[in-house]
Interface confidence: medium
């Protein structure tokens, strides 16, 4: 999977991060979780292996199995937001997943706008994280 | 803000059928999935079956195969539940829910009595 | 099916009380599981999704904790309000499957 190192933006915004997969895993599970450590990260959301977007809260996902590419989109940020996310495929065996850094700036601080991935903050995923799903 | 706002009580007869309605707004509806919920006299919940918005796909709990028919108006936001040859232990109240875990209709309530 | 254990059908506790609301899977449902609150004559609304998520505008008084078949809804500071029916949910597997409710009642 590939997916933005990092993505910031403000306060009571919103964020959009894209997540890249390859040929094969079209029909699975995709899922969107929180937490440093990638074996006891919390899924927010998930996909149920077709097309159709979920949306939970104030967190949704949708998978272009065509583009081979799900996003996920969290609004109405708040500062404790903050923290390590995952873009992640279930699958038979360990997990695919890839790490990103959800950076909120405080109201009224300087902030740029929430960036979306670029060529520059992609980090392809080459194996080193590993997650047994349930 | 986003709503969905079900058909109103129904009393039918066993043997009959019925259509409740369950309109979306406030969202774009082929965005996410609907399901359907059915809570007896009892309060005992149960799932129904979820329904893919984009094609109109349902993924039906075994129960609930057979006499029930989900399906989808997208022109007017609206999903439907038709219920065949009705008897009594259907008798319930029928909830439509978006994505399940999140927004509720505010429920139908469907009488089955001879 | 998953079958979803609420052992207790009814509460009873005073304001200002914490109170905990118990739910055992059958099988291993990971953390995938919400808790729903129905009062009389209204409509389940979703108060925790992913075992201990909050839903936007649900008050801090209400905890969701749990992984794996255990799972509990931890109310802190329980207020009249909070008069009602509990019910765990699990999305884990097809068919989803409720508990079967825990009422609250308030001495």
């Known amino acids: 999977i590939q997916g933005p190192e990092s993505v910031r933006a403000p306060e009571q915004g919103s964020l959009t991060v894209q997540c890249h997969y390859k040929q094969g895993w079209e029909t699975y599970i995709k899922w969107w979780c929180r937490g440093v450590r990638w074996d006891t990260c919390k899924i927010l959301i998930e996909t149920r292996g077709s097309e159709q977007g979920e949306k939970s809260d104030r967190v949704s996902i949708k998978d272009n199995q065509k583009d081979r590419t799900f996003t996920v989109t969290m609004e109405g940020l708040r500062r404790d937001d903050a923290d390590v996310y995952w873009c992640g495929i279930e699958r038979r065996g360990p997990d695919l997943g890839t790490q990103v850094k959800v950076i909120v700036d405080p109201e009224g601080a300087a902030s740029t706008t929430a960036s979306s991935p670029t060529n520059s903050n992609m980090a392809v995923f080459i194996g080193s994280h590993k997650r047994n799903h349930y | 803000q986003i709503q969905l706002v079900q058909s109103g009580p129904e009393l039918k007869k066993p043997g009959e059928t019925v259509k409740i309605s369950c309109k979306a707004s406030g969202y774009t509806f082929t965005d996410y999935s609907l399901h359907w919920v059915k809570q007896t006299p009892e309060k005992n919940l149960k799932w129904m079956a979820w329904?893919?918005?984009?094609?109109?796909?349902?993924t039906y709990a075994d129960d609930f195969k057979g006499r029930f028919a989900f399906s989808l108006e997208t022109s007017s936001n609206t999903a439907y539940l038709l219920i065949n040859n009705l008897k009594n232990e259907d008798t319930a109240t029928y909830f439509c829910?978006?994505?399940?875990?999140?927004?509720w209709g505010q429920g139908t309530t469907l009488t089955v009595s001879s | 099916d998953i079958v979803m254990t609420q052992s207790q059908k009814f509460m009873s506790t005073s304001v200002g009380d914490r109170v905990s609301v118990t739910c055992k899977a059958s099988q291993n449902v990971g953390i995938r599981v919400a808790w729903h609150q129905q009062k009389p004559g209204q409509s389940p609304k979703t108060l925790i999704y992913s075992t201990s998520y909050r839903y936007s505008g649900v008050p801090d008084r209400f905890t969701g904790s749990g992984s794996g078949t255990e799972f509990i809804l931890t109310i802190s500071n329980v207020q009249s309000e909070d008069l009602a029916e509990y019910f765990c949910q699990q999305y884990n597997s097809y068919p989803y499957t409720f508990g079967g409710g825990t009422k609250l009642e308030i001495k």
């Open positions: 329904i893919n918005t984009e094609t109109g796909a349902p």
């Open positions: 829910a978006l994505t399940m875990v999140n927004y």
